[in-house]
């Protein structure tokens, strides 16, 4: 049937698309860049990414229409809504703070929530994250222990414990929770670089033509014999 | 053999400063660890400043007690480290030790010590 | 910093008798733990690194235990030339610190 379907006959698909046979009578169009379309016969108006604040575009007729998202208006969703317009969106006396897309409520002493409408209480639930425990001090203040390795007022950091370190032989460190590592160098290994690598024992083979090897701090060595030298017993 | 052998101490008055040296010989300088540790008379070990190898780009580290008051600083070339000591107190007085860091968090190797007295 | 307790300060013995030091850390230190021996007018001299590994030319009476906080000293068998005072040192990060020192004297 290829000679009568409308792919040949009709070549349906305009500035330079593509036609692709689906059954006896239909058809899709595979479009050129910048061309929309069933039949690709619209230009692709939402090529210059008209469309702002991540909202969705579409081409309908060579004109281009876009979806804002929530928090966004305008033709091409270029304007903020303004919620703090709205009153009510902050309870208890809180203060709206318009932010792109959103808002927030800056809570007086005491509540607390996205529209302060909880009343706050210091270590419920625990503002201290990485296992530190939190102390009510007050009212509405609270402090937070910390674990070994961590600190600020939530313990929200890891204490680089790199600038103390230890790392021998030329390992480097690698900071960890209360403690740091050390990336060694291949002839060294160990948590801090101080055990030697037996080279003998790992490479069977690393003397040749009968050498022995012996093993040293940081490397090894060959005993060559019958007229054999190098480092390898090789030459 | 490793050696290491201090010098450059002596009396001097509160506020004043001095620079001890320590000259090692018998291993390849660059490849180690270097550190001061002190004892005053009749008292403990004190680490007092470390400088680490080449492949640590021979970052430096002090105590507490004496940052933004000494220095340690190495010659390659001399074989030789230094500790630069400036605003010294009475509490500084102390035999101070030039000590090789041998590559097992321990330290292998000592110098004979050399004194330093800070009196008016 | 990383707190060294050594214990005992001072401990009187004979020859031949055994001695046992210990070293409490503040924090873990992952055996990174030395001990040394220094006599009167002397610099301090390397026993044991790595808490238990004895250093070379030290003779197999001395020997060292523990890992975590927890680190011990031992002279099996007291020699008359083993009459000096012994300090632990931590070596996991700096600053370097050192406990207090403990006098073997004899008896």
């Known amino acids: 049937y290829s000679t009568s379907h409308p792919c040949f006959v009709s070549r349906p698909c305009l500035n330079g698309g593509t036609c692709h046979m689906l059954s006896r009578d239909t058809y899709e169009c595979t479009c050129q860049v910048g061309f929309t379309g069933k039949e690709c016969q619209w230009t692709d108006a939402c090529l210059s990414h008209p469309c702002a604040n991540g909202s969705t575009c579409t081409t309908v007729a060579n004109q281009f229409s876009c979806k804002c998202l929530t928090g966004f208006t305008g033709q091409k969703c270029e304007t903020d809504v303004n919620e703090c317009d709205i009153p009510g969106h902050c309870q208890h006396g809180g203060t709206c703070l318009n932010l792109p897309g959103s808002y927030q409520c800056q809570c007086p002493q005491g509540f607390t929530g996205q529209y302060c409408d909880s009343l706050y209480v210091p270590c419920a639930p625990s503002p201290c994250v990485n296992g530190g425990t939190c102390r009510q001090t007050g009212d509405f203040t609270f402090e937070c222990n910390c674990l070994p390795g961590f600190e600020g007022s939530t313990c929200e950091r890891n204490i680089d414990d790199c600038p103390n370190h230890r790392c021998q032989n030329g390992g480097v460190c690698v900071d960890g929770v209360n403690t740091y590592n050390c990336r060694c160098p291949p002839q060294w290994t160990g948590q801090f670089c101080t055990e030697d690598v037996d080279e003998c024992l790992l490479q069977p083979n690393a003397c040749q033509n009968g050498g022995t090897c012996a093993n040293r701090n940081g490397g090894y060595g060959c005993v060559c014999v019958n007229g054999w030298s190098g480092d390898d017993c090789s030459e | 053999e490793v050696q290491l052998v201090e010098s450059g101490g002596g009396l001097v008055q509160p506020g004043g400063s001095l620079k001890l040296s320590c000259a090692v010989s018998?291993?390849?300088?660059?490849?180690?660890?270097m550190e001061w540790v002190r004892q005053a008379s009749g008292k403990g070990l004190e680490w007092v400043a470390a400088?680490?190898?080449?492949?640590?780009?021979?970052?430096?580290v002090y105590s507490a007690s004496v940052k933004d008051r000494f220095t340690i600083s190495r010659d390659d070339s001399k074989s030789t480290l230094y500790l630069q000591m400036n605003s010294l107190k009475t509490e500084d007085t102390a035999v101070y030790y030039c000590?090789?860091?041998?590559?097992?968090?321990?330290?292998?190797?000592w110098g004979q010590g050399t004194l330093v007295t800070v009196s008016s | 910093d990383i707190q060294m307790t050594q214990s005992p300060s001072s401990v009187s013995a004979s020859v031949g008798d055994r001695v046992t030091i210990t070293c409490q850390t503040s924090?873990?230190?992952?055996?990174?733990l030395a001990w040394y021996q220094q006599k009167p007018g002397k610099s301090p001299k390397l026993l044991i690194y790595?808490?238990?590994r004895l250093q070379d030319g030290v003779p197999s009476r001395f020997s060292g235990s523990g890992s975590g906080t927890d680190y011990t000293l031992t002279i099996s068998s007291l020699q008359p030339e083993d009459f000096a005072t012994y300090y632990c040192?931590?070596?996991?990060?700096?600053?370097?610190?050192f406990g207090g020192g403990t006098k073997v004297e004899i008896k």
């Open positions: 400088q680490r190898n080449k492949a640590n780009d021979f970052s430096i």
């Open positions: 790595g808490a238990s």
């Open positions: 040192q931590q070596g996991f990060k700096y600053p370097l610190t």
């Open positions: 018998g291993f390849t300088f660059s490849d180690f660890y």
């Open positions: 000590s090789r860091d041998g590559g097992r968090l321990a330290l292998d190797a």
């Open positions: 924090e873990d230190i992952y055996s990174g």
